[in-house]
Amino acid sequence: FGISGRHSITVTTVASAGNIGEDGILSCTFEPDIKLSDIVIQWLKEGVLGLVHEFKEGKDELSEQDEMFRGRTAVFADQVIVGNASLRLKNVQLTDAGTYKCYIITSKGKGNANLEYKTGAFSMPEVNVDYNASSETLRCEAPRWFPQPTVVWASQVDQGANFSEVSNTSFELNSENVTMKVVSVLYNVTINNTYSCMIENDIAKATGDIKVTESEIKRRSHLQLLNSKA
């Protein structure tokens, strides 16, 4: 098909982060077209010669795909017609980090938008009471982080207190020699209090909470990506 008009179409991306070894999504939406056959999606990465992915005439066109992405990319083919050009990236690698461009051609015109994709490792921490310790101790563990994060303890009762003197954090390299297991121990824990173990790097922030009372132990954890913004 040909583009006869002089219009540019709106393309929108969202910065995101990929967890090494897992699947990731590079988000991109555009003004939809009526005919799927009139839509071309091209994903590019700065510094890479070949295409990351190309979708045209209703199917993948991978003849110009760069070898570093071979077998690792897919668009949501059934959602292209409604303006979803997002890319699924399988088995995210550290080297996938960088600037990507989502380039769209339709019968209405063309448009493109860039997105920054960060890669690293992040996981939920779990906080437990360490019954093997000589004193009341909490142990915070998270299996996979990269780059090396910071670990900070906080407590509901002693708000603003600095626990660095009564805690010890270690980082153990995992078998794939990139990510690390995070272990932090908090000593001199008092009962009837809620403690938080906060793990953070430039990609994600995760918190593990534990509430210790005479009768029960309650745990809660959550993880937030730091760079997801439009």
């Epitope: 590019l44 010669l49 380039y103």
Partner: antibody, heavy 117, light 105 residues
Framework: EVQLVESGGGVVQPGRSLRLSCAAS????????MNWVRQAPGKGLEWVSA????????YYADSVKGRFTISRDNSKNTLYLQMNSLRAEDTAVYYC??????????WGQGTTVTVSS | SYELTQPPSVSVAPGKTARITCGGN??????VHWYQQKPGQAPVLVVY???DRPSGIPERFSGSNSGNTATLTISRVEAGDEADYYC????????FGTGTKLTVL
């Protein structure tokens, strides 16, 4: 300031070899693909070769394929063009240029290669 | 292989508008870039992605691209705009147009 400075040009006999260098500064060199572009005397621009940021992938114009090799040393922020089996028609000013998506946003000042017996 | 055709020369009076065309099969579906080259100097990017301007390039330079023709428009032409202009697309390599010499009368 982003800068590209070519060197290594000169006069060489047909069939001989020459290696051009391009020193890059002012940007994260390893994250950008790079190009060599040439311009014969009184002629237009002709793309020669491109290399990915990591150096793992390269493309060549048909006119130089099998004779020229593009490479890079990211630890030295330097781009190279090894030119073998040189011909008279390879006489040109050779520019290195930083690739930006589908185009080139920064160019060096060029280095002159003359192939003559 | 993909070919881009430009007129060899375009002449324009100072203060007027110059239009330089770049023809290619369905070029409207490609991203077109324009370079200015003055004698003895390296090319300079003046328009990228059809119509965007790099920082430092005057607003007088604009571009459009549709169908089989991309156009570089220079409004209020100045003597300093006299140069060779090249269009360029990517097609498994950089493809340059034949070049247009802009003469300011």
């Amino acid at each position: 300031e982003v800068q590209l400075v070519e060197s290594g040009g000169g006069v060489v006999q047909p069939g001989r070899s020459l290696r051009l260098s391009c020193a890059a500064s002012g940007f994260t060199y390893s994250s950008r693909a790079m190009n060599w572009v040439r311009q014969a005397p009184g002629k237009g621009l002709e793309w020669v070769s491109a290399i990915s940021g990591s150096g793992s992938n390269a493309y060549y114009a048909d006119s130089v394929k099998g004779r020229f090799t593009i490479s890079r040393d990211n630890s030295k922020n330097t781009l190279y063009l090894q030119m073998n089996s040189l011909r008279a028609e390879d006489t040109a000013v050779y520019y290195c240029a930083r690739k930006r998506w589908y185009g080139m946003d920064v160019w060096g000042q060029g280095t002159t290669v003359t192939v003559s017996s | 292989s993909y070919e881009l055709t430009q007129p060899p020369s375009v002449s324009v009076a100072p203060g007027k508008t110059a239009r330089i065309t770049c023809g290619g099969n369905n070029i409207g579906s490609k991203s077109v870039h324009w370079y200015q080259q003055k004698p003895g100097q390296a090319p300079v990017l003046v328009v990228y992605d059809d119509s965007d301007r790099p920082s430092g390039i005057p607003e007088r330079f604009s571009g459009s691209n549709s169908g089989n023709t991309a156009t570089l428009t220079i409004s209020r032409v100045e003597a300093g705009d006299e140069a060779d202009y090249y269009c360029q697309v990517w097609d498994r390599g950089m493809i340059f147009g034949t070049g247009t010499k802009l003469t300011v009368l």
